[in-house]
């Protein structure tokens, strides 16, 4: 509703409008005119024969528009009547037995245009219609219908025929008293007061009563003639004079303030008539009789030059009895009626809903359930007139107005704001929580992917992408093939999965060669002078690799580096049937831990089991037998990152590399290479 | 609490008779229709008969037309069935049950009396 | 003579949707009711009028009748919905019980 700019009065009326004439929540009474019901056979749905016959009473039930009509909570109303008549009957307008016709279902919501009817008749042998006290089988027929219907005087006529029975009736919806519109949610109350005078119009919109104009009616027209700057109007057809001026039409100055007998011919100057002198032209010696100031029929007696005392009757005060005692004093009209005095006493003329002599009693009391959406209603003076007890969320006089805490719209990120009473609270969308769903939730911040999956958020929760040889939602499940589980490995033999061809390997004690350690290193009948070379040779060759080493060890102990920074040894030569266990790799480097990196083939990535890297063997070069008792024991696990994985593809180098992500601090890789002859671990600080 | 006791269950031969009563307390008996409902080993329910609240109107499933009769004893808050001429297809559980009205159904049950029929 | 016609049995898995049906000529116009009945112990009416719940019947009970089918539904089915259940309605001076259908929560 527009509001012109006013003064701080003109807002206090408008607002008072504005809750007088406004879009509201609707009001309407949906009519159903009952005018025939045929039973001819005087049966039940059952079909089984009435007794003595169907004495009949309809329940109705009116609810939102269904395609198809259940039999769910009747949203809209519903209503019963008495016993109409038996088997078949026609229905008066006014039916007798205390019942209504047509039957009236009251709604306070904007009418949406569209409903479901559901009509059932009954039989009650007795005067008790309560559902206990009717036979089991009671029903006689029950009809549904649904559409639309728009609001109107015009009745639809319907009839619905089931088997046995035939119902003619007819229904409407018409708004209530005071709502207006095409769905009557447009509430307009005619008056005719300080705060409008106009009548409503179908529509809902204001027409102002004669004599008055303005938006809301409220600005009166006045006395044709009027003096437009010197004069203004409360009411038609008046003219109020603006200070300074008087007359019919307000085009009359008025003297100085206390001029008494004097004249102006500009406001506020006073030039005293005849016989009169002083600056107010109000001093005489026969003050009495010259200027009669009592007022109000009082007794004038003169008291010396220009003095005079007024004996006033009963009902006066002041010096010239020119001020009324007014029995409005004491505020003897309740309820918001304004007092006016009267020769005999005075008149309380109360507001809208109050009447009596001092505006005591209202003319609503509880049985008109006053009281709006589950507001509980209090009688007080006996009755006379009332109290209403809002629920939480709804407040006002009649509890019409609804308390919403969301109208803020405080709830972040998608959040839904709910009512809870007294307060409110948000229903955060998946992913987000705080008391204002104002925090984001990480699921990953759990690592909840095992085995080295990597975790991705997403917005209705999290995703796993699991490393080659598990799966599952949470990388939990191995696919691999365990191919050391039938333990295919001869004489104590340690076996090894190679997980890119799940094949196994076996890694020999002494004494034992073969793919299966199956045959043992014996010593035949004739002296084996080919394997004794050998054996001399390599034994001579392993002391020279010692020897090299050392003495590479000792130039690098010369060297000014920090140990802490060492490289890894480089590896060769390795023999085709030995495998490294995991625990004889050592980590010089204690800062890190071993990560390995597999180049551009990421899907050999994923954890099996867990191999470990011994920080406690001293650096030296890897090779078989170190720490013969310490396998598989170690202090540090490389399960957090990547572990090792043993191949036995290519018998020159049976260490091949998976994928780790980098260490984001000190970017150390580990680098296993797969060329012919070599295997080099390195590290890069 | 509301409640629906069901006695004189037994075995008899068939052509034999038995009668059955159904004491009812924690509601006003006298204001309700009753019912008896059977329900044979290993079977569906079957209505037998129903009553009205003051006696007066009675009516029994075909099958047991003329042999059963339904009666009510307002006073003594009780329900009877007298079964005659029974026969073998008559072995059941009979409860007593409380007809809700206004096509509601049956609201409350009895724990059932077990009447088996054979020779 | 009028007969209702329910399925011997419908599976379900818990907190699933169980829908049983029971058939009949223009049922529809009739009201129906539903009784769980779990063994060696008494019937107890769950739905009445088609769609109405007595007090202590939790809300995952649900009923609808139209045409000539009426439906029970039980919403978030529990394990201790597991249980026969009936439909019953009226003809003539006889009360009609379906035949009944064995519900099981696997």
């Known amino acids: 509703m527009a509001a012109a700019s006013r003064s701080a009065s003109g807002w206090a009326l408008l607002l008072l409008v504005a809750l007088w004439q406004q879009r509201a929540a609707g009001s309407g009474v949906f009519q159903l005119q009952l005018q025939e019901f045929i039973n001819e056979r005087g049966v039940l749905a059952s079909g089984r024969p009435c007794e003595p016959g169907c004495r009949t009473f309809f329940r109705v039930c009116l609810k939102h528009f269904q395609a198809v009509v259940s039999p769910g909570p009747c949203t809209f109303g519903t209503v019963s009547t008495p016993v109409l008549g038996t088997n078949s009957f026609a229905v008066r307008d006014d039916s007798s037995g205390g019942g209504r016709n047509p039957l009236q279902l009251p709604f306070n919501f904007t009418w949406p245009g569209t409903f479901s009817l559901i009509i059932e008749a009954w039989h009650a042998p007795g005067d008790d219609l309560r559902p206990e006290a009717l036979p089991p089988d009671a029903l006689i027929s029950k009809i549904a219908i649904q559409g639309s219907l728009a609001v109107g005087q015009n009745w639809l006529l319907d009839e619905q025929t089931s088997t046995l029975t035939r119902l003619r009736y007819s229904y409407r919806v018409i708004c209530s008293d005071n709502y207006y519109g095409d769905n009557c949610s447009r509430l307009c109350k005619k008056r005719n007061d300080h705060f409008g005078h106009y009548v409503c119009q179908p529509d809902g919109n204001l027409s102002c009563l004669p004599g008055w104009t303005g938006e809301y009616c409220q600005q009166p027209i006045c006395l044709s003639g009027c003096h437009e700057q010197n004069g203004y109007c409360s009411k038609p057809a008046e003219c109020l004079c603006r200070p300074g001026w008087q007359g019919r039409l307000c085009n009359e100055c008025i003297p100085h303030n206390g001029c008494r007998h004097g004249t102006c011919s500009t406001p506020w100057q006073c030039t005293c008539d005849e016989g009169w002198g002083g600056l107010f032209c109000d001093q005489d010696l026969n003050y009495c009789t010259h200027h009669s100031p009592c007022k109000n029929g009082a007794t004038c007696s003169n008291s010396g030059q220009r003095s005079y005392t007024c004996t006033c009757r009963p009902g006066y005060t002041g010096v010239d009895c020119e001020l009324e005692l007014s029995e409005c004093d004491s505020n003897p009209c309740r309820n918001g009626g304004s007092c006016k005095d009267q020769e005999d006493g005075y008149h309380c003329l109360c507001p809208p809903g109050y009447y009596g002599l001092h505006c005591e009693h209202s003319t609503l009391s509880c049985a008109d359930s006053p009281c709006f959406n589950g507001g509980s209603c209090r009688e007080r003076n006996q009755g006379a007139n009332y109290a209403c007890e809002c629920p939480p969320n709804f407040t006002g006089s009649n509890c019409e107005k609804k308390v919403d805490r969301c109208t803020s719209n405080p709830c972040a990120n998608g959040g839904q704001c709910l009512n809870r009473g007294p307060s409110r609270m948000c229903r955060c969308r998946p992913g987000f929580t705080g008391t204002y769903c104002e925090l984001h939730v990480s699921d990953c911040a759990r690592n909840p992917c095992a085995h080295g999956g990597t975790c991705h958020d997403l917005e209705n929760g999290l995703m796993c992408t699991c490393p080659a040889g598990f799966s599952g939602r949470r990388c939990e499940v191995r696919t691999s093939i365990d191919a050391c589980a039938s333990s295919p490995c001869f004489n104590r033999a340690t076996c090894y999965t190679d997980l890119s061809t799940d094949t196994f390997v076996c890694n020999c004690p002494y004494g034992f060669v073969g793919s299966r350690c199956e045959f043992p290193v014996g010593l035949p009948p004739s002296f084996p002078w080919v394997a004794v070379s050998l054996g001399v040779g390599l034994a001579v060759l392993l002391v020279l690799l010692g020897m090299v080493a050392v003495a590479v060890r000792q130039l690098r102990l010369r060297r000014p580096d920090d140990g802490s920074r060492e490289a890894m040894n480089n590896l060769s030569d390795f023999q085709k049937d030995n495998l490294i266990p995991a625990a004889q790799l050592k980590n010089t480097n204690q800062k890190k831990e071993l990560e390995v990196d597999c180049g551009l083939d990421k899907s050999n990535c994923g954890k099996q089991q867990n191999h470990t890297l011994d920080y406690n063997l001293a650096p030296g070069p890897l090779g078989r037998g170190t720490m013969p008792g310490k396998f598989p024991h170690s202090d540090k696990s490389l399960g957090e990152k990547a572990p090792l994985r043993l191949h036995s593809e290519k018998p020159e180098c049976r260490i091949s590399a998976i994928c780790s992500p980098r260490d984001s601090m000190y970017q150390s890789v580990c680098l296993i290479s797969e060329e012919r002859n070599e295997c080099v671990i390195a590290t890069e600080v | 609490e509301v409640q629906l006791v069901e006695s004189g269950g037994g075995v008899v031969q068939p052509g034999g008779s038995l009668r059955l009563s159904c004491a009812a307390s924690?509601?006003?008996?006298?204001?309700?229709?009753m019912s008896w409902v059977r329900q044979a080993p290993g079977k569906g329910l079957e209505w037998v008969a129903d009553?009205?609240?003051?006696?007066?109107?009675?009516y029994y499933a075909d099958s047991v037309k003329g042999r059963f009769t339904i009666s009510r004893d307002n006073s003594k808050n009780t329900l009877y069935l007298q079964l005659n001429s029974l026969r073998a297809e008559d072995t059941a559980v009979y409860y007593c049950?409380?007809?809700?009205?206004?096509?509601?159904?049956?609201?409350?049950w009895g724990q059932g009396t077990m009447v088996t029929v054979s020779s | 003579s009028y007969e209702l016609t329910q399925p011997p049995s419908v599976s379900v898995s818990p907190g699933q949707t169980a829908s049983i049906t029971c058939s009949a000529d223009?049922?529809?116009?009739?009201?129906v009711s539903w009784y769980q009945q779990k063994p060696g112990q008494s019937p107890v009416l769950v739905i009445y009028?088609?769609?109405k719940r007595p007090s202590g019947i939790p809300e995952r009970f649900s009923g609808s009748n139209s045409g000539n089918t009426a439906t029970l539904t039980i919403s978030g089915t529990q394990t201790m919905d597991e249980a026969d259940y009936l439909c019953?309605?009226?003809?003539?001076?006889?009360?009609?019980f379906g035949g009944g259908t064995k519900l099981t929560v696997l």
């Open positions: 049950a409380k007809a809700g009205g206004g096509n509601v159904g049956f609201d409350i």
């Open positions: 924690g509601f006003t008996f006298g204001n309700h229709w």
């Open positions: 009553i009205s609240s003051d006696g007066r109107y009675k």
């Open positions: 223009k049922l529809g116009t009739k009201y």
């Open positions: 009028q088609d769609a």
């Open positions: 019953q309605s009226w003809d003539r001076s006889d009360v009609v």
